[in-house]
Amino acid sequence: LNTTVLQGMAGQSLRVSCTYDALKHWGRRKAWCRQLGEEGPCQRVVSTHGVWLLAFLKKRNGSTVIADDTLAGTVTITLKNLQAGDAGLYQCQSLRGREAEVLQKVLVEVLEDPLDDQDAGDLWVPEESSSFEGAQVEHSTSRNQETSFPPTS
């Protein structure tokens, strides 16, 4: 499966569209997950509505939003207020029971705004950063938020 590389500017939104065969994936929920390693687990960020007929409704987790057009066969993920910590390799998945079929691999590259005076050596993930489904999120004393990635796939 080829990897699609998408670039986004820090502070802006990035929209990802994953297309699929609407007939083949009829009745299946979709998910967006972050791959923690080359052969490691893919930690779910957000998934579409539990009721498939309502998959068109936007579902949000932190700054990540997902919606599925099941007739057109397009699931759209929006990463809002993109931050350096959002960079990574993600998967669009089609869920069937406990199985997850990879629809697309997406490498998200976050570019710093060259006009921004912020210290580019300090890549804090800010308070608005998205958390992960089922993940514990602890606030530290600095202005970042440490997001946990449990080792579940």
Epitope: A87, L111, A120, S140, E146, P150
Partner: antibody
Framework: EVQLVESGGGLVQPGRSLKLSCAAS????????MAWVRQAPTKGLEWVAS????????YYRDSVKGRFTLSRDNAKSTLYLQMDSLRSEDTATYYC????????????WGQGVMVTVSS | NIVMTQSPKSMSLSVGDRVTMNCKAS??????LAWYQQKPGQSPKLLLY???NRFTGVPDRFTGGGYGTDFTLTINSVQAEDAAFYYC?????????FGGGTKLELK
């Protein structure tokens, strides 16, 4: 098999420049963040700088900011570290590393190249 | 910057022993931690990422645990080839900082 081969190290006087290169093979270079990590003699590891997969953004540790420049040539699968205004405290073995998708951990390392800054 | 402190500085064990080394972060880092092994004269090698995920080819005698500020690397039944320096590293949020290392020697 992932391979990272560094070159360009050597002995240099304080205030002078040196350019390190890292030739990568065994993976799609343009799909990966890359970084340099250094290790002073008999000391621990120290992250130096990282670069996004396209080279669009670079990040440096405070002590090298303004002196070191990280760049890449995706067509040649090569990473570069231009080191200017070198100081004695920059003396170290410099490792070229592949950084996993912006996560800040380094899954593959080169053999390292020694940089000695001394008069 | 978050400081990573490793303990003990060094330890000497026999083949077959179970060893646990520690890494303490000065602030909460969630489970954003990696461990590396560096044998004498060699480059570091990734062992574990996000606290407990073993990297490709790493034997299952290496296990990681902890959360927040306190982390452990455990080697069940130490082998002669495990003699090395072990470094922890705070990941996910830069600047990426390493601990000072723990030296594991075999008797």
């Amino acid at each position: 098999e992932v391979q990272l081969v560094e070159s360009g190290g050597g002995l240099v006087q304080p205030g002078r420049s040196l350019k390190l290169s890292c030739a990568a093979s065994g993976f799609t270079f343009s799909n990966y963040y890359m970084a340099w990590v250094r290790q002073a003699p008999t000391k621990g590891l120290e992250w130096v700088a990282s670069l996004t997969n396209s080279g669009g953004s670079t990040y440096y540790r405070d002590s090298v900011k303004g002196r070191f420049t990280l760049s890449r040539d995706n067509a040649k699968s090569t990473l570069y570290l231009q080191m200017d205004s070198l100081r004695s405290e920059d003396t170290a073995t410099y490792y070229c590393t592949r950084e996993w998708a912006g996560s800040g951990y380094f899954d593959y390392w080169g053999q390292g190249v020694m940089v000695t800054v001394s008069s | 910057n978050i400081v990573m402190t490793q303990s003990p500085k060094s330890m000497s064990l026999s083949v077959g022993d179970r060893v646990t080394m520690n890494c303490k972060a000065s602030q909460n880092v969630g489970n954003n931690l990696a461990w590396y092994q560096q044998k004498p004269g060699q480059s570091p090698k990734l062992l574990l990422y996000y606290t407990s995920n073993r990297f490709t080819g790493v034997p299952d005698r290496f296990t990681g645990g902890g959360y927040g500020t306190d982390f452990t690397l455990t080697i069940n039944s130490v082998q002669a080839e495990d003699a090395a320096f072990y470094y922890c590293q705070r990941i996910y949020n830069s600047p990426w900082t390493f601990g000072g290392g723990t030296k594991l020697e075999l008797k």
